[in-house]
């Protein structure tokens, strides 16, 4: 079956602050009650779970992985946070209202190949990109 | 002051369903009742607000934007979403619990240039990459 | 080259208290945010409380209401005040500083122990 994974849905806690613009680096473990930080996790997405079998002939499936965790102030140094997701940070931990926290998404992809049938019922070899995480950062 | 939004926390209802690989494209309005699709929104952001008004001379603040919204089954065909985005999209809706949704991400960002003081009290002129949210997808 | 250097490290009885300071060797433009860290043997690095240029702080649970982060804008230097130690604050407590636009510089470390 498709994947698994255990998942936080927990709110950071935010007390009050005003600063500046690269503290993507602050933190080798920011969240002050444990929460992950973002990163990269594992998923197995297989195509028939998807209904995706009639057309795709290989592979079966694939490891997609997917990105998840926290980017919270002060962000981890591996984040690849880029400048304006340190400034949504900081915009956040001075008011939570006023933004989201940035979110913890793919910062590389790589392709696969799929053999697949076409329209035609022709046999297509074909790369699809950015099918598989490779790393995930703060955005 | 720096910015300010209303934002909805809801999580999407996701009745189950299979599909395939451009499914991206599928719908125009996405969301069964009517929650905000992911997009940019305003945000203006005040130096002063940061902490940063000892280094920075100008400007005062930007217009920085962000990114917020659903990345819900089906994606709006103007969500730029990934190949990864998609197929999680349908993982997330088959199984809400195997992984999140997408998160809504800057897909394009701007430059700005900052007139500051550098470490020895020299003024310098410098553009800072990736400051300002020029467009949003899901990734 | 900018260095961090810190200072007020030591050994203690449980309960006891200590003050670390780190202090930049020059000025730092563009500092937004400081921080303690601490590593023990065996474990990663984790963050113990951190501070903004407009003196905001945030602290890891394990040491709320017992540590205080605190700087002087002027003398470019960060301050630790820990209280009622216990023996797992054993470690070493790291300095690092945020500049916007570069890497962080991080101090050598100072070491603390707490005995029972």
């Known amino acids: 079956s498709t994947g698994s994974k255990q998942r936080s849905q927990n709110r950071s806690k935010t007390p009050k602050n005003q600063e500046a613009l690269r503290m993507a680096n602050v933190a080798e473990n920011s969240s002050s009650d444990q929460r992950q930080a973002c990163k990269k996790h594992e998923l197995y997405v297989s195509f028939r779970d998807l209904g995706w079998q009639d057309w795709i002939i290989a592979p079966e499936g694939y490891a997609a992985y997917y990105c998840e965790g926290e980017c919270a102030f002060p962000l981890n140094s591996y984040m690849n946070a880029t400048n304006h997701a340190i400034v949504q940070t900081l915009v956040h931990f001075i008011n939570p209202e006023t933004v989201p926290k940035p979110c913890c998404a793919p910062t590389q992809l790589n392709a696969i190949s799929v053999l697949y049938f076409d329209d035609s019922s022709n046999v297509i070899l074909k790369k699809y990109r950015n099918m598989v995480v490779r790393a995930c950062g703060c955005h | 002051s720096t910015g300010s939004k209303q934002r909805s926390q809801n999580r999407s209802k996701t009745p189950k369903n299979q599909e395939a690989l451009r499914m991206a494209n599928v719908a125009e309005n996405s969301s069964s009742d009517q929650r905000q699709a992911c997009k940019k929104h305003e945000l203006y952001v005040s130096f002063r607000d940061l902490g940063w008004q000892d280094w920075i001379i100008a400007p005062e603040g930007y217009a920085a934007y962000y990114c917020e919204g659903e990345c819900a089954f089906p994606l709006n065909s103007y969500m730029n979403a990934t190949n990864h985005a998609i197929v999680q999209t349908l993982v997330h809706f088959i199984n809400p619990e195997t992984v999140p949704k997408p998160c809504c991400a800057p897909t394009q960002l701007n430059a700005i240039s900052v007139l500051y003081f550098d470490d020895s009290s020299n003024v310098i002129l410098k553009k800072y990459r990736n400051m300002v949210v020029r467009a949003c997808g899901c990734h | 080259e900018v260095q961090l250097v810190e200072s007020g490290g030591g050994s203690v009885q449980a309960g006891g208290s200590l003050r670390l300071s780190c202090a930049a060797s020059r000025r730092i433009s563009g500092i937004y945010a400081m921080g303690w860290y601490r590593q023990s043997p065996g474990k990663e690095r984790e963050l113990v409380a951190a501070?903004?240029?407009?003196?905001?702080?945030n602290y890891a649970d394990f040491v709320k209401g017992r540590f205080t982060i605190s700087r002087d804008k002027v003398n470019n230097t960060v301050y630790l005040e820990m209280n009622t130690l216990k023996p797992e604050d054993t470690a070493v407590y790291y300095c690092k500083q945020s500049a916007w636009g570069r890497n962080d510089y991080w101090g050598q470390g100072t070491r603390v122990t707490v005995s029972s």
């Open positions: 501070i903004t240029t407009s003196d905001h702080t």
